[in-house]
């Protein structure tokens, strides 16, 4: 807290300019008018103030706007944004995508800070949904953003926004998140032809049900092993050997290297060894010939 002292004669700031870096903290407090600061915030970022000095300027803005800063000030905070606490940011009402971009730029190229997380939360809540332009912006700055949302939050993503999603944006998504995103992607890409559709939907397939995987197996898609390994185990288990062979195409040979890992391991345990042998890959662990297969899950459902 800076002591209230009178501004020395001739030092009253008439504009926010570089001469202010030569002001001591108490001079900034005494000689810079908060309203002037608010109208000329865009200049502050171009002046190499110390954060100690910026603290004084922040204090002046806090006094002027105790209920939270107006967007005209927020948009021009620049490096002063890095002095804001999440509590400060929760008071803001940020509606302009330009404001969001300006503040994300300050944090660019680095992990999401608590301030940025709060800012994004305020912005998205204010908009009511995660529209395409917002998603475009957020994933450009933070590729992992989508996967940081809960399934409930993801449910507000309209299918049209899915076009903004790049494969790397989904790298850290878990199955619960993909369960929500996959139906939206399916809807978004439904009018595309076979090969184009597969290219777009591929990253979302970790949320695909069995019937969709069966349908894909009829389309010569040649799914790579990395994608196959990310499929839901419960969606893979009902697939036949023939369906998996068609789904993977030339990549089917990769099953051997993955036979100890899910979902391949669990799928092998559900197939007849005879059928597995037709692949010629030496996959072991299938059901021996002559054994009866009981679907216990079906039996439990009936009892």
């Amino acid at each position: 807290e800076v002591e209230k002292t009178a501004c020395p004669s001739g030092k009253k700031a008439r504009e926010i300019d570089e001469s202010l870096i030569f002001y001591k903290k108490w001079e900034l407090e005494a000689c810079v008018d908060a309203a002037l600061l608010a109208t000329q915030m865009d200049r502050v970022n171009a002046i190499p103030f110390t954060y100690e000095q910026l603290d004084v300027l922040k204090h002046k803005l806090d006094e002027l706007y105790p209920q939270g800063y107006p967007e005209s000030v927020i948009q021009h905070l620049g490096y002063l944004f890095l002095k804001m606490s999440p509590e400060d940011i929760r008071k803001w009402n940020v509606t302009s995508l330009e404001t969001l971009k300006a503040l994300l730029e300050v944090n660019k190229g680095h992990e999401m800070s608590p301030q940025v997380a709060t800012l994004i939360d305020r912005f998205v809540k204010g908009r009511g949904q995660l529209d395409k332009d917002t998603l475009d912006t957020l994933t450009a700055f933070y590729p992992g953003y989508l996967c940081s949302l809960s399934p409930e939050e993801l449910s507000s993503v309209p299918p049209s926004s899915i076009w903004a999603v790049r494969p790397q944006d989904l790298d850290t998504c878990d199955p619960r998140q993909l369960d929500v995103l996959y139906p939206k992607a399916r809807l978004a890409f439904q009018n595309m032809n076979g090969s184009e559709y597969f290219v777009k939907i591929q990253s979302f397939l970790g949320g695909a049900p069995t019937e969709d995987l069966k349908a894909l197996s009829q389309q010569n898609v040649s799914m790579d092993l990395a994608t196959f390994m990310k499929l839901r185990t419960d969606a893979v288990l009902p697939l036949t050997v023939a369906e998996v062979q068609k789904l993977l195409g030339p990549h089917v040979e990769g099953l051997k290297a993955e036979e100890r890992h899910r979902p391949v391991r669990d799928w092998i345990l559900r197939q007849r060894q005879d059928d597995l042998d037709t692949l010629g890959l030496g996959l072991q662990g299938g059901i021996p010939n002559g054994y009866l297969v009981l679907d216990l899950s079906m039996q439990e459902a009936l009892s």
Epitope: A46, T50, Y51, Y79, S113
Partner: nanobody, 119 residues
């Protein structure tokens, strides 16, 4: 984060010195950089500063004689001081306006200072 100054020493009036400040450690980012000085019994005051965009600002008393520069590849800031005067005897401090990700806030970083004596 550490800022380490070097290049200080004893110089005759009218002489020149070049101060260097090397930044090391993991810093989130550096925005502005500056040189400050503190004469015996005085408060620390800015001498020269540079914004992230490369604009430079000088105290009136050093304009035309001092030059601040920055080599981003070497993480180093320089202060070229020419036509030095006895009253410029002081400890010169390097300053960086940065961001500490661990703290989650913008931070002021200061070097330990390098002594310049003009006599």
């Amino acid at each position: 984060v550490q800022l380490v100054e070097s290049g200080g020493g004893l110089v005759q009036p009218g002489g020149s010195l070049r101060l260097s400040c090397a930044a090391s450690g993991s810093m989130f980012s550096i925005n502005a950089v500056a040189w400050y000085r503190q004469a015996p019994g005085e408060q620390r005051e800015p001498v020269a500063a540079m914004t992230s965009g490369g604009s430079t600002i000088y105290a009136d008393s050093v304009k035309g004689r001092f030059t601040i520069s920055r080599d981003n590849a070497k993480n180093t800031v320089y202060l070229q001081m020419n036509s030095l005067k006895p009253e410029e005897t002081a400890v010169y401090y390097c300053y960086a306006q940065g961001y500490d990700y661990d703290e989650g806030y913008g931070m002021d970083y200061w070097g330990q200072g390098t002594s310049v004596t003009v006599s």
